[in-house]
């Protein structure tokens, strides 16, 4: 996602309030959580910590030579973590889901 | 990667010449190939064809409410394909690698 061009691709905090996104209608708890976000640029040379694919390396090299032909690789979540949520099931019974997958960034990389 | 905001996230052609990126020193053939690129925006609501993760959906909703707080999800390769390359091994023998992985975009998505 977007980020200051001065910083390289990294994971930063992103507090999300379920009421803000309209999910409070079914998620009882938590009221908010840290989704994190991937922020920053994918600059040449791509560092090992952004685990670039070969395609990302190629795209970065093409961008370096022809900046108007193709954009840089993008800083995105490459590994996600679950969170635990309390929600109402279809019977209206409050139910705990320990692993609601893919809700929080674990790792960022250049893709 | 970057793309016209008017079009949604999709795979488009990106011809890459190995000489342009300095890889002609070790890749003998092909001289060029289609790496493809992922281009376009990840707009609300995220369509099924961009296979959004839950995090991408959350980020899109937060961006919708607070556009300055967080950027949109990014259109990136979600599946890569190999290409075949001819290169010189350490004995100087031209060698065919049938599956040089991760070189070409197979699918794009919003992450």
């Amino acid at each position: 996602s977007t980020g200051a061009a001065s910083s390289h691709c990294q994971k930063t905090s992103l507090r999300v309030n379920f009421e803000d996104i309209g999910w409070d209608s079914w998620i009882i708890a938590p009221k908010e959580y840290d989704a994190y976000e991937c922020k920053g640029g994918c600059f040449f040379p791509l560092a090992d910590d952004v685990t670039p694919t070969k395609h990302a390396i190629v795209q970065t090299l093409v961008h370096l030579k022809f900046p108007t032909k193709v954009g840089k690789a993008c800083c995105v979540p490459t590994k996600l973590s679950p969170i635990s949520i309390l929600y109402k099931d279809d019977m209206g019974v409050p139910t705990l889901k320990y692993h609601y997958e893919g809700m929080s960034v674990a790792e960022c990389g250049c893709r | 990667s970057t793309g016209a905001a008017s079009s949604h996230c999709q795979k488009t052609s990106l011809r890459v010449n190995f000489e342009d990126i300095g890889w002609d020193s070790w890749i003998i053939a092909p001289k060029e190939y289609d790496a493809y690129e992922c281009k376009g925006g990840c707009f609300f609501p995220l369509a099924d064809d961009v296979t959004p993760t839950k995090h991408a959906i959350v980020q899109t909703l937060v961006h919708l409410k607070f556009p300055t707080k967080v950027g949109k999800a990014c259109c990136v390769p979600t599946k890569l394909s190999p290409i075949s390359i001819l290169y010189k091994d350490d004995m100087g023998v031209p060698t065919l690698k049938y599956h040089y992985e991760g070189m070409s975009v197979a699918e794009c998505g919003c992450r």
Partner: antibody, heavy 118, light 111 residues
Framework: QVQLVQSGAEVKKPGASVKVSCKAS????????MHWVRQAPGQGLEWMGE????????NYNEKFKSRVTMTVDKSISTAYMELSRLRSDDTAVYYC???????????WGQGTLVTVSS | EIVLTQSPATLSLSPGERATLSCRAS??????????MNWFQQKPGQAPRFLIY???NQGSGIPARFSGSGSGTDFTLTISSLQPEDTAVYFC?????????FGGGTKVEIK
Amino acid sequence: QVQLVQSGAEVKKPGASVKVSCKASGYTFTRYWMHWVRQAPGQGLEWMGEINPSQGGTNYNEKFKSRVTMTVDKSISTAYMELSRLRSDDTAVYYCAIGANYGGLVYWGQGTLVTVSS
Amino acid sequence: EIVLTQSPATLSLSPGERATLSCRASESLDNYGISFMNWFQQKPGQAPRFLIYAASNQGSGIPARFSGSGSGTDFTLTISSLQPEDTAVYFCQQSKEVPRTFGGGTKVEIK
């Protein structure tokens, strides 16, 4: 450096068999396919087949399939080509050659002349 | 099997002249963006020498005056400035499929 040294010239009678050897040095023997190519006097090149020294797998030219056997002895880095039921038109120079995995013949032996005559 | 037809059968030129040798395949030799065409030089009483591979790449130690071009079914070996030591028979070979096949050869003579 890479070297392929072949066995000496042979004279055989029609119906007999011949076994030509090719001793390899200067590289890891099991790394590349070994090809056999023959050339009749004043004629062009004819591919006979190839063997993978690592597993012993072979690909033969259909023309020779019933008469040719390619083998290797990894312990002495040597490839062999045996041709049976010889005819006078088998008179040729037989070459071994190291093949890249895409089929190009990169290094060649010096050749072995096999003469079939009654 | 793939049939390779070389022309002319004999080429007689003066030193310094440009030699153009042709090889036509009965079907395309292209696969994976690679042309599976090789050229060999054979001098009298000697084993063939690996000259050009993958249509346009020089083998180790081959003088720059030798170049290859072409794709699909039509290939050319060019000797830019003939030298007396270039007197030889030149064979094309396809390595796309088994059986590997050779052309009938072109004999190059120096006047």
